[in-house]
């Protein structure tokens, strides 16, 4: 069976928009469907439609298509906002330029090159012809619009209304002529949707045929509309992923605008003595990297070959061998004249914000060079040079020593959650600093999000105990007790560590808490043989806003048939939508005669955007949250379940993908649960386990 082409790439999408017909004579056709792709395929093929389809609306709430013989530019029609609607207009009907020979052109130009009005295609006056709309179905020989139904050289044409001139081509420009860009096109927001070799671009909001990281909702400022060429990553010019499964991406043929000036909004603040932000506007003359090695000239290919040339990166001032940041790196850099060191950062250039004790950082703060030297817990930072041994223990590369001066907050290990420092306090060996991200900074902090295909499961198989897979075992489930009563759930992720929520700790006195492991009954009835009761020796609070706590046990749990650990997901991983997961807890059940036994509710993973819709748009989820909806209406976590896990299985391996936290009500029908996304904090968890001392068993 021939695989039907996906035609949604031929449409321009306007989110949260519908069309209302003012003229009652205009027809529309509706039908229940599952996806916008299905609507698009039918619109393109005009299958079963009593008109030529020019646009459609997909109603996400009702899962319905509305096909139209008109678009937003037609008369008798108005645009209207609607949360549940997405409008898709066939680009051929709204484009005012041609691609190639203009065979697909369906615009409304109706005047020839010399200015003569076109003859309607259905008329035989003044010229008789065989180009009847009925003979050229799908070629849109409507009214008297210029067309090229046979794809002839010269582009769209028409019979003219002048009896002396039978036909003439129309003066419709090539899209590649109309479209132009400044510099390397990072600010280009035009409508070019095919590559320089003519391949159609893949939509940015699609992951087929090519999976990629550039999701429109993750990069709202990059202009990822439809399938238009863009330059989000500092390439020499705009590009796109293609619909050809064998060509992942290609550049687009967009010429440089004659008046090559940038908009004010595109110009980074130019500085010559210091670095503002990531230093994209640095135009000074420093020409050595941090350790004094001279820079290679940008226009030279020796000793290192590269494509970061002044020709490829116009407007980036790649003069001489000066440090620059043409590609949105952490800070200005250059290729070096040492054949063994390809590139180096010029981190000796001071930060313009250096005078502020408490400023802000961009991205994950890897390049923060401020002079704050106090942690969020109020402890004074200790000198970096006293802690290099500890630092080497948990990073596997040589840190940039020029940045680690004094006891200032820094991020030498690429921590996703910002600058930190060592404290000299054995209770809190290191902690984050009270610096926030700069306002308006949208740099993603998860490096791995570049590869959304990253699996959450480590590749190992499910652990087997005594030859039987422990699939039914929930030995990692912890009952946290506060003053002898159950208060929260938790997950045993290591013999000495329990992952739970910060809302589970109403007291700072650790003597108020105990962890019960190996139990099924919240009161421990009948669990005497398997129950382990452990004191709590420390609470390590997660990064700012995480709501997570790592609870250190006074002694390690003994792993046996009733007590086991649960795996953590890979950092920054994505779990597919509709993956079946479970939440566990001893919390409020709504039952008067609750038996105290551990309960499970089955949920399935839901994408953040869809989740937000279920919350009526009142909730915007971010990269640190994960959403799961109930299979059974009105089931889900509640008070007493907080701190407990959202457990999912991938490649036969169970992992804690979410942590239950308060704040969204209990199991409200049609309101999916929002959990802390453990994958976002996995590196922090590993770093704590690695750097905090635990008692030996």
């Amino acid at each position: 069976q021939r695989k039907r082409r996906n035609t949604i790439h031929e449409f321009k999408k306007s989110a949260k928009t519908t069309l209302i017909k003012i003229d009652p004579a205009l027809k529309i056709k509706t039908k229940k469907v599952n996806t916008a792709d299905q609507c698009a395929n039918r619109c393109t093929r005009n299958k079963g439609l009593p008109f030529t389809c020019k646009a459609f609306v997909f109603d996400k709430a009702r899962k319905q298509c509305l096909w139209f013989p008109f678009n937003s530019m037609s008369s008798g029609v108005k645009k209207e906002f609607g949360h549940e609607f997405d409008l898709y207009e066939n680009k051929d009907y709204i484009r005012n330029c041609i691609i190639g020979k203009g065979r697909s052109y369906k615009g409304t130009v109706s005047i020839t090159k010399s200015g003569i009005k076109c003859q309607p295609w259905s008329s035989m006056i003044p010229h008789e012809h065989s180009f009847l709309p009925s003979s050229y179905r799908g070629k849109d020989l409507q009214e008297n619009y210029c067309r090229n139904p046979r794809g002839e050289e010269g582009g769209p044409w028409c019979f003219t209304s002048n009896p002396e001139v039978r036909y003439e081509v129309c003066d419709i420009p090539q899209c590649s002529e109309v479209e132009c860009m400044t510099c390397n096109g990072e600010s280009y927001r035009g409508l070019m949707d095919h590559t320089e070799s003519g391949k159609i671009c893949q939509r940015w909001d699609h992951q087929t045929p090519h999976r990629h990281k550039f999701l429109p909702e993750r990069y709202p400022d990059k202009g990822f509309d439809d399938n238009y060429c863009r330059n989000p990553d500092g390439q020499p010019r705009p590009w796109c992923y293609t619909l050809d499964p064998h060509t992942r991406w290609e550049y687009c043929a967009i010429k440089t605008c004659a008046d090559n000036t940038m908009n004010d909004t595109d110009v980074p603040l130019e500085t010559t003595e210091c670095i503002q932000g990531q230093g994209e506007g640095y135009r000074g003359t420093v020409n050595t990297i941090w350790n004094g090695i001279p820079c290679q000239r940008w226009d030279s290919q020796y000793p290192h070959e590269h494509d970061m040339t002044p020709e490829n990166f116009k407007c980036k001032d790649l003069r001489e061998n000066y440090c620059r940041n043409p590609d949105g790196s952490e800070s200005p850099w250059c290729f070096t004249t040492d054949p063994n060191i390809r590139v180096g950062y010029c981190s000796q250039i001071p930060n313009c914000d250096m005078s502020h004790g408490q400023d802000c950082y961009r991205g994950n703060g890897k390049n923060y060079m401020g002079n704050l030297s106090q942690t969020r817990s109020g402890l004074t930072c200790s000198m970096w040079d006293k802690n290099m041994e500890d630092l080497h223990r948990h990073i596997f590369w040589e840190p940039d020593a020029s940045k680690l001066n004094e006891n200032y907050c820094r991020n030498p290990d690429d921590d996703a959650h910002g600058p930190w420092c060592y404290t000299g306090n054995p209770l809190i060996p290191w902690d984050y600093c009270p610096i926030s991200r700069c306002e308006g900074d949208t740099t993603p902090t998860i490096v791995n999000l570049d590869h959304p295909v990253i699996s959450c499961a480590k590749t190992k198989q499910l652990r087997v105990v005594n030859g039987i897979p422990t699939r039914t075992n929930i030995g990692w489930m912890v009952s946290l007790r506060y003053r002898n009563k159950h208060i929260c759930g938790g997950s045993l992720i290591k013999e000495s560590w329990v992952l739970t929520a910060r809302q589970c700790f109403p007291s700072r006195d650790l003597k108020d808490y105990e962890a019960w492991l190996g139990i099924h009954d919240v009161h421990g009835r009948g669990d005497e043989k398997c129950k382990q009761v452990l004191n709590v020796s420390q609470l390590v609070y997660g990064p700012e806003g995480s709501d997570l706590v790592l609870m250190k046990l006074a002694r390690p749990a003994v792993l046996d048939d009733f007590v086991s650990t649960i795996d953590l997901p890979n950092y920054g991983c994505t779990i597919p939508e509709k993956t079946s997961c479970s939440v566990y807890g001893w919390g409020y059940t709504g039952l008067i005669n609750y038996d105290g036994l551990l309960r499970v509710a089955h949920l399935y993973i839901m994408g953040n955007e869809k989740c937000s819709q279920h919350h009526r748009g009142k909730v915007t989820l971010n990269e640190s949250e994960i959403c799961a909806g109930a299979e059974k209406i009105g089931s889900g976590p509640c008070e007493g379940d907080y701190g407990g896990p959202l457990v999912c299985e991938q490649h036969k391996m169970r992992m804690v993908l979410g942590v239950i936290v308060p704040g969204r009500g209990c199991a409200i029908p049609n309101r999916p649960g929002i959990f802390v996304r453990v994958a976002y904090y996995a590196k922090w968890i590993h770093k704590i386990i690695l750097t905090y001392k635990v008692p030996q068993s």
């Epitope: 402890l379 306090n425 809190i428 009270p434 809302q503 109403p506």
Partner: antibody
């Protein structure tokens, strides 16, 4: 981030008692401490005590033991403070204040205050 | 009880000037868990106090970066780098390390 709606002003006689209320919204009432703070006209702030609605736990400033009684009703997300044996010294504005749990332990949401006036 | 001593009681400043308020506690505010629970609040006339700085030096959300806090142990400082008209009011330091929680007597920031 949450809101606290306090009951209206009270005019009471010496020796009487008064019960003022504080209704919470926009956050999980049972998962934060509710504190009460006293402010006499032109004076500083004095901490009276706090209650953890999830468990009914209370801590009091020794100075207000026997004077203030803190209670909470989880079903209506409302905290109460009863002041007994009132004297002119008890005339003040009383604030209910949410205390965020660890790692913070700060007062991030304040009610608008309830004015209690004791006069014969 | 921990006594919080704030100085000065009144601080007349010109708009655009830097202002500095000191707060001293009668005992260390470092909790046994390593954290220092010293916070700063601002109360404008006729309003409830609002949180500015928590745990010595963390700016609360929405607080302008002209406010900064520093200090350790028993000595703490709140600095306003360039005073604006909206900053006028009474500033209180407060500790939540030891029960009962206690407040400083307040510093009134006013126009010179």
């Amino acid at each position: 981030q949450g809101q606290l709606q306090q009951s209206g002003p009270e005019l009471v006689k010496p020796g009487a008692s008064v019960k003022i209320s504080c209704k919470a919204s926009g956050y999980v009432f049972s998962s934060s401490w509710m504190n009460w703070v006293k402010q006499r006209p032109g004076k500083g702030l004095e901490w009276i005590g706090r209650i953890y609605p999830g468990y009914g736990d209370t801590n009091y400033n020794g100075k207000f033991k026997g004077k203030a009684t803190l209670t909470a009703d989880k079903s209506s997300s409302t905290a109460y403070m009863q002041l007994s044996s009132l004297t002119s010294e008890d005339s003040a504005v009383y604030f209910c204040v949410r205390e965020e749990l660890g790692p913070y332990w700060y007062f991030d949401v304040w009610g608008a205050g309830t004015t209690v006036t004791v006069c014969s | 009880d921990v006594v919080m001593t704030q100085t000065p009681l009144s601080l007349p400043v010109s708009l655009g000037d830097q202002a500095s308020i000191s707060c001293r506690s009668s005992q260390s505010l470092v909790h046994s868990n390593g954290n220092t629970y010293l916070h700063w609040y601002l109360q404008k006339p006729g309003q409830s106090p609002k949180l500015l700085i928590y745990k010595v030096s963390n700016r609360f959300s929405g607080v302008p970066d002209r406010f900064s806090g520093s200090g350790s142990g028993t000595d703490f400082t709140l600095k306003i780098s360039r005073v604006e008209a909206e900053d006028l009011g009474v500033y209180f330091c407060s500790q939540s390390t030891h029960v009962p929680y206690t407040f400083g007597s307040g510093t009134k920031l006013e126009i010179k």
